[in-house]
Interface confidence: medium
């Protein structure tokens, strides 16, 4: 099931600033049918010292954030859960410089899931932290419709069926 109702908290400058930060994003139905609640409290735990962030083993650091590149392949929702379970989130790309960093570190030529999907609720492309994509900077190649998730390849963002299996990138 595509996660489109819940909104992940933006953890900026390493602090979770208000009381709403620990609200649950709601139930997430995983492919095996089980449900689990994800608290935003977890999402911010590893961002408490953004300016002096130390990335875990196997994570790359760039501009105060940590990035992890998968080797296996999963659907978008399974990739989403995987990142959350590791107190991170699917990749959110803020600008072309960050995109360039990502591409530089992508060794494979195939598609890689990022934290962007078309939400049927908002009828727009939305990052997993709830922010809309900046359409002036990024163009999503392909249709904007229900059950579409975004994957990157060669600095391009493509609309793909969320059930497709690709590698993915986690970020915190």
């Amino acid at each position: 099931l595509l996660v489109s109702q819940g909104v992940l908290l933006k953890c900026q400058k390493g602090s979770c600033s208000n009381a709403t930060q620990y609200e649950d994003t709601g139930d997430l139905k995983v492919n095996n049918g089980t449900r689990r609640n994800i608290s935003n409290k977890d999402l911010c735990a590893s961002r408490s010292a953004d300016q002096t962030v130390l990335c875990q083993s196997e994570w790359l650091k760039y501009q105060g954030k940590c990035y992890w590149f998968s080797n296996e392949m999963k659907s978008w929702s399974d990739s989403y859960v995987y990142c959350l379970e590791r107190k991170s989130h699917l990749l959110i790309i803020h600008d072309q410089l960050e995109m360039a960093f990502i591409q530089k570190n992508l060794r494979q030529l195939n598609y890689v899931w990022i934290g962007l999907n078309f939400t049927s609720l908002k009828m727009t492309w939305t990052w997993v932290d709830g922010s809309p994509i900046d359409s002036k900077i990024f163009f999503i190649k392909g249709p904007a419709k229900e059950n579409s998730c975004a994957a990157i390849k060669e600095s391009k963002i493509f609309s793909e069926t969320c059930s497709s299996v690709f590698k993915w990138i986690c970020q915190y």
Partner: antibody, heavy 117, light 105 residues
Framework: SLEESGGDLVKPGASLTLTCTAS?????????MCWVRQAPGKGLEWIAC????????THYASWAKGRFTISKTSSTTVTLQMTSLTAADTATHFC?????????????WGPGTLVTV | DIVMTQTPASVEAAVGGTVTIKCQAS??????LAWYQQKPGQPPKLLIY???TLASGVPSRFKGSGSGTDFTLTISDLECDDAATYYC???????FGGGTEVVVK
């Protein structure tokens, strides 16, 4: 380059399959293969696209769903199956490749194949 | 769905002159617009993408401009070979304008 084939004169209600063959490149990840049609003396009308990557996801114009099926049949061919054809389907059908990331535009086109119903 | 409205339907100009074709989107498409040229019996040819970027091999006489909802294709120093129908296309596959026939006298 791209070349279409399979255009023919058919009776209303008939089915027809068009084929698009690529030369000089093979289908791979990173772009979409599409069909666009043009009725005589009319404008361009998008029919469908198929993703050239492994997932092969398909996308159709709302009016084309159900009657038209786009498929990737090999690393160099894409087909368009058309059923329950009517006179309104009479058009030149173009195969086009969309590999731009600066909009959903078509960079490479085939010469077209005429379907007359 | 985004609807592209193209004007005029037909325009006539002399060799060496200038032609302006307008395309309006029903909602903002930022700069995600392409222009095509089509001659009788031929497939369309990509002229401009991302509103103002010339496709390879297209002469600089063709100029695209605009953003948001209003876009313009300007053809200057008209040549006989520019006689054709021109189409705009918005940021989705199905969003074609109705076309503008350019007649060069």
């Amino acid at each position: 380059s791209l070349e279409e084939s399979g255009g023919d004169l058919v009776k209303p209600g008939a089915s027809l399959t068009l084929t698009c063959t690529a030369s000089g490149f093979s289908f791979s990840s990173g772009y979409y293969m599409c069909w666009v049609r043009q009725a005589p003396g009319k404008g361009l009308e998008w029919i469908a696209c198929i993703y050239a990557g492994s997932s092969g996801s398909t996308h159709y114009a709302s009016w084309a769903k159900g009657r038209f099926t786009i498929s990737k049949t090999s690393s160099t061919t894409v087909t368009l199956q058309m059923t329950s054809l009517t006179a309104a389907d009479t058009a030149t059908h173009f195969c086009a490749r969309d590999d731009g990331n600066s909009g959903d535009y078509f960079k490479i086109w085939g010469p077209g194949t005429l379907v007359t119903v | 769905d985004i609807v592209m409205t193209q004007t005029p339907a037909s325009v006539e100009a002399a060799v060496g002159g200038t032609v302006t074709i307008k395309c309006q989107a029903s909602q903002s498409i930022y700069s995600w617009l392409a222009w095509y040229q089509q001659k009788p019996g031929q497939p369309p040819k990509l002229l401009i993408y991302k509103a103002s970027t010339l496709a390879s091999g297209v002469p600089s006489r063709f100029k695209g401009s605009g953003s948001g909802t209003d876009f313009t294709l300007t053809i200057s120093d008209l040549e006989c070979d520019d006689a054709a129908t021109y189409y705009c296309q918005g940021n989705s596959w199905g969003a074609f304008g109705g076309g503008t026939e350019v007649v060069v006298k």
